[in-house]
Each structure stands twice: as C-alpha cells, then as structure tokens.
Amino acid sequence: LYFSRDAYWEKLYVDQAAGTPLLYVHALRDAPEEVPSFRLGQHLYGTYRTRLHENNWICIQEDTGLLYLNRSLDHSSWEKLSVRNRGFPLLTVYLKVFLSPTSLREGECQWPGCARVYFSFFNTSFPACSSLKPRELCFPETRPSFRIRENRPPGTFHQFRLLPVQFLCPNISVAYRLLEGEGLPFRCAPDSLEVSTRWALDREQREKYELVAVCTVHAGAREEVVMVPFPVTVYDEDDSAPTFPAGVDTASAVVEFKRKEDTVVATLRVFDADVVPASGELVRRYTSTLLPGDTWAQQTFRVEHWPNETSVQANGSFVRATVHDYRLVLNRNLSISENRTMQLAVLVNDSDFQGPGAGVLLLHFNVSVLPVSLHLPSTYSLSVSRRARRFAQIGKVCVENCQAFSGINVQYKLHSSGANCSTLGVVTSAEDTSGILFVNDTKALRRPKCAELHYMVVATDQQTSRQAQAQLLVTVEGSYVAEEAGCPLSCAVSKRRLECEECGGLGSPTGRCEWRQGDGKGITRNFSTCSPSTKTCPDGHCDVVETQDINICPQDCLRGSIVGGHEPGEPRGIKAGYGTCNCFPEEEKCFCEPEDIQDPLCDELCR
C-alpha cells in the first residue's frame, strides 16, 4: 500500500463545528488483495516540526480515509497550541497519517507509508458562502500532485470535492471534470467526483501526465469556470532488463602510448529503460564483475561503472532511462616492454530485476598491449643567442611519439663533450614527455671558444632503463651585451611596452623582454604583459622550466595575490586579466589594471 500524495492541505477556522468533514486521504494498492487502513499520528505539529499537543480535535475513518473534526477548535485551544510554537505565529499545523499495517514510528513520516496533512489556520469563523471566490470553492490553495507506481492495480487516488465547502455551503453547486486526451488511463466519476486509474500504468511508456482539472461553479444565475493543473507522476520499478544498444557487446582496444594508471582503454554501453535503483543504491545493486582470467589481467585492469540518466522517446513523449557505461581501465602503469593480447569478460547483473528473462549481460573486451621502443632522431641542430638569459628555453627534444605518451616516464640527460662549454640544461616536461632545453650557464655562452656546443642527448625509460641517444649541435650566435644595471630580474615587472623592451629578464632567449599586446576585451586570457618569450609565457601553464624561478614567468606561476580584474589560474598564476598585468615576484603580487590611456607616446603624437 502507498499514499498517492506525500502531503495534503486544507483550511481550519475557529469554532468550526464538530463533525465537519475536512478531506479524504487515498491509498493505492501494491497487490490486488491489499486493503488500506488509515490511522492518525498522535500529535499535532507546528513551525519547524515542533510537537505542539496531542491531537484531540481531528479524527480519521480508518477504512475510508476521511478526516473530520471530532470537536470544535475554539480560541482557547488555539492559544494553547500557539504558546507551544516556540514564539512563532501559528499559521499552519500538520498531522501525520499512516497506512496500517505499515508500522512506522511516530517520529518518521516518509512516503510511501506516511503522508502529512497541513491545515492553514484562520483566526476567524468560516466565511460567508457568498463571499467565497470560485477558486476558493473549487480547489485547495496548494496545488496537488500525484505519484502512482507503475504495474500496480488501478484504484482511486483523489476526490475533488472541498468537503468543508460542500458541508457548509450546500446551495452552491460545484461540478468537476478532467481534461484529457483520448485513451488516457484516468477517469473522474461524475457522482462521487473520485479520480481513479483505469488500468495499471507503464512508466516506460509515459512518465508524466500533465492533466487539467476543470471546476464549474453554479451559484444562482452565476456560472464560473476554474482550471488548474493536475499533474501525475508515474513511479518506476525495476521491470526492464539491461540490453546492448544496437547489439554491441564487444569492444576492441590497443594499449600503446597511453600506459598510465587510470587510462580508459575501452568502453561498452548498456541500456536500461528503468531509472531504479536510485543513484545512491545503483552501484551496489547493479553490479559488474571482471570474470577471472589470468592473474596478470586481473591485476592490470579494472572495470568502472558510470551510470547516467538519459531520456528516450516513447509514444510521443520523453521518459527517463539509464545508460550504464562500463569502462575498462588500467589499474597500474604498464611497462613499455609489455606485449600481450587477451580477451576479458565482464558480467553485469541488474540484481533488482525480477524477470521475465534474465537481468544479466556478458561484456567482452579484446585488448592488445603493444610494446613501445624509444627512438630519437640522429641529430638535433639548434642555435642560441649570446645574449640569452638564464632559463631561456631554446628548444625541445622528444622521443618518437612522446607527445602521445602517458604513464611512460622518460628522463632526458645532456652529456657535454667540452667541460667548459656546458651551457645548456634539460628538464623533462610532465605534460608531453619531451625534454625542454634551456640556458643554464650564461657565462659559458660568452666564452669565444664556446661558439659551437656539442652534446649527446640520452633518453632513458625509468622503468626498464631502455635508452635512446642523439647528437645535439648548438650554434652560439650574436655578440654579448651586458645586462643593464637598472633592470629588474623579471620581465613581468614592466607595465608599459617601452620599459619592457629596453630590458632583459630571466628566461629571455634574446636578452630582451617581449611585450605581448592584449586584445583589450575585458577580462581576457590575452591580457597585455611583459614576458621573456611570448611563445612560452604567459600561456596559462607553469611549465617545468618556469617552476625553477618565480622571476621567469610569475604570470603563469605566482601563488601570491592578484590585485584588480582577473580570473585566477588553476592552480596558480593569472588565467585571464583586465588590461595590463604586471607582477612583483619578490612581493608575491601581480596587478591587472586598465591600459593607461595617458601614455607618453600618445602625449607626443597628440602634440
């Protein structure tokens, strides 16, 4: 048994007569043989669930669900209740109605076995019938909505009449009907005004019925019509078996360059027309098991269940359904030497499904793990300016396909042929497994005998110690110019183009900072700023070279405060800024401000 609503509303007036009918509550059956029996909770409740008093005023007919006044609620009774309402004005009280045999403790009131009945209290007597508006004669103030379980026996779930109005205003004629399309499973009995289902409902065919209730009021010569929405929601049960969309039960995958733990290798999708079990219960009740194969496969792969609600069209309306993605995921990083082919099977079980048929599916994954060999081109040729500053990025080295690698830990090292000309350093980028070449020793750059630098690049896979090698030839170009005395260590300090370009800074490949002119479009990623090299800074990412010194690119790397219009980077730096952004690394501060329209260059041009 279950209530067709979780809450009911009616009005209560001072000194309403004992015996006044108030409203009907309705229960629907889960099985044909069930017979509802209603009982009221012992207490009346007020604001914030305050227990006010034992209920001495309202009774229920156990078999019909009719609530009525057992005794009149007079002023003194009302004041007694108000005193207990924690000082709040007592505008609404509620009762709990339980369905026997459901034995719920008085404290809890959860649908489907309990409903709340709210009474709006008016500190006046019942108004004169002639003063009631048609809306008040027809429907409660709060619009009802109904919940009906699918596949259950049909039954009565609502009674239109406002019982106190019918009781106290017998001369006013009120008629009701439901506006509904052809073939809908509801009927309104013209005599009793009871609304019932004609047959059991199927949620997978239709989940929501947006009906309209029409009330016609006859009072003397006057006839008025009032319409209100009458929504019915069909509640789901697990009556659909999982299926494969388009019959696809097998996925094939190749594991090659992406070998990192948590990499999704392949995905198979399962469709279920149901939306139960609910999300909290779903993973526990909708199980997936990687069937035992060889131990290596069990250790290397796991299956992740990702359910998602979707909507599908049924009979011209949309109903909710569930798609379950089953992802085959790497449980650990795979060595580049691994080389295997296997078939994995996953058993999916919708454990709540009762049939007909089985709620079990078998998913198949065909997986090939290919080995990776490390290759470098035979020779790299690069040039570097004699004016380059420390940490200037001058190029990249990268084993074949390194941009596609994940879970492969390649470290790069440089071996210099001339000990006094060891100018460059290399660091491995975590993003694309490349090696970034940067200037590490500017003194060596200035030595006349270091015009050509020869290195051996060695790439080593940390897990297997496999290696690849390449020659690196670096030509040193240009002549050295001493750093200006009044220039800051960081290019980012400058807030104007001309003062930016007259200085160098850490990370500058040319020995001069570069100005990046922004697009001037509010808070933008393309803000104006001074940078050692606009190729790498700012780019919204604090790279492995920039992490070595905050002065290189505080726009990407600063963890301090940013003043002015901006969007902070994740996890640091400036993602977007307003106007011009400049930074003071030693003070851990950046400022983003409107471009200064009073630029001296403008002053000159305007003269």
Partner: antibody
Framework: QVTLKESGPVLVKPTETLTLTCTVS??????????VSWIRQPPGKALEWLAH???????SYSTSLKSRLSISKDTSLSQVVLIMTNMDPVDTATYYC?????????????????WGHGTTVTVSS | AIQMTQSPASLSASVGDRVTITCRAS??????LGWYQQKPGKAPKLLIS???SLQSGVPSRFSGSGSGTDFTLTISSLQPEDFATYYC?????????FGQGTKVEIK
C-alpha cells in the same frame, strides 16, 4: 658620482621663451630605466612636476602646461633641455632637474633619487 | 589628474616625538608613491620609494606604509636634522603629481 646641474637665464620677460639645460654626469641618458624630470617650486609654495624624458626618448608632460612645454635630450652631450613658451610672472620659480630611475635591490619601483641644486628664474618686465 | 592631499599642512613637534604624515590619493595608485624631504634653500631628497622601501643611506627612523589611496610617512623619533618640509609624489599615472607638502617645525 652622479650629478645634475641646471643652467639658464635668471631673468625672463613676460611672453618670452625660457630654455633650461640640465647637464648630467655619472650615468648615461640612454641607459635602461634612466630618465630625467623637470620640477619647479614657486617661492614659498609646493613642488610641481613639469615634464619627463625616458631613456627610450618617450616624453610626458604636465596636463596644465602641455601646450607650453617641450622636453628633449642630447645623449652625446649628456644634456636634457626644457623649453617653456609664453612666460608669465606666475612662472617665477626655482626649476629643478632630477634623475628618475629604478630602485635597488629588485629594480621594481622608481624614484627621483638625485636632484640638481636648482636654478631660480624670475619673470618680470 | 590624480590629486594628492597631504595632512597636516604643518605640525610642531619636539625632538624624540613620533611624527606621522599622511597622503591621500584621489584614486588608487597601488604603491607607486615616493616621499621626499626638502630643507630650506635645498633640493628635495628621496627618502622612500614604492610607499615603503627605504632609500639607501636614509635613517631607519623613517618608515612608509600604505597601498591604494592612503599612505603614511612615520618618523619614529624626531631628530633636530628632520625639521623640514615633506612631500609625497605619485608616479602611477600621468601627469605625476606632488602633495602640497607638510612642514615639520620645532615646538
């Protein structure tokens, strides 16, 4: 040692043009972040900034006097020249030139760290 | 132009006193503000740049603070040679502007 020295006429007639020269030593006018400002101070009154020339040769002027001022430099002579037209008795003041540069240790911020002694200009018929 | 308002216009103090001079900008100037000391018949001298950075060779009894619109110059213990006029200068935006000065006199 860094020094700045102002030179120019002591007396100027109304409507005439004033030309002041600032000769610097101990630093180059083309060095990065080195600029020279002109500032004046009427007798018993506050300082008033007039104009500035940057190492990059860009210039900036006081808004109220912009139409009457012109600043320039000759790097080879280590001189900065200020020309002020249409002189008036209210322009009677001591005129200073000052070096504006970035401050150690981080060279983030600027200050007028070295000033000339000033030259007094009287405007009278 | 940004207005710089200094207060007080003048003050009388004794040797050893703690003296505070404030400078308020008509709009935010970050910390692009310098403090200058001028003695009669002499050129001004830079004390503090960037609102709080003490110039080399300036006694540590001078200190500066503030950011945005409100700035303070503090002399923790006034010495005989500190009797002078003090000016603030903003060089955040053109045209650069001085405050009207605060004259510190012997009480």
């Amino acid at each position: 040692q860094v020094t700045l020295k102002e030179s120019g006429p002591v007396l100027v007639k109304p409507t005439e043009t004033l030309t002041l020269t600032c000769t610097v030593s101990g630093f180059s006018l083309s060095s990065a972040r080195m600029g020279v400002s002109w500032i004046r101070q009427p007798p018993g009154k506050a300082l008033e900034w007039l104009a500035h020339i940057f190492s990059t040769d860009e210039k900036s002027y006081s808004t109220s006097l912009k139409s009457r001022l012109s600043i320039s430099k000759d790097t080879s002579l280590s001189q900065v020249v200020l020309i002020m037209t249409n002189m008036d008795p209210v322009d009677t003041a001591t005129y200073y030139c000052a070096r504006r540069t970035t401050m150690a240790p981080y060279y983030y911020y600027y200050g007028m760290d070295v000033w000339g002694h000033g030259t007094t200009v009287t405007v009278s018929s | 132009a940004i207005q710089m308002t200094q207060s007080p216009a003048s003050l009388s103090a004794s040797v050893g006193d703690r003296v505070t001079i404030t400078c308020r900008a008509s709009q935010g100037i970050r910390n692009d503000l310098g403090w200058y000391q001028q003695k009669p018949g002499k050129a001004p001298k830079l004390l503090i740049s960037a609102a709080s950075s003490l110039q080399s060779g300036v006694p540590s009894r001078f200190s500066g603070s503030g950011s945005g619109t409100d700035f303070t110059l503090t002399i923790s213990s006034l010495q005989p040679e500190d009797f002078a006029t003090y000016y603030c200068l903003q060089d955040y935006k053109y045209p650069w502007t001085f405050g009207q000065g605060t004259k510190v006199e012997i009480k």
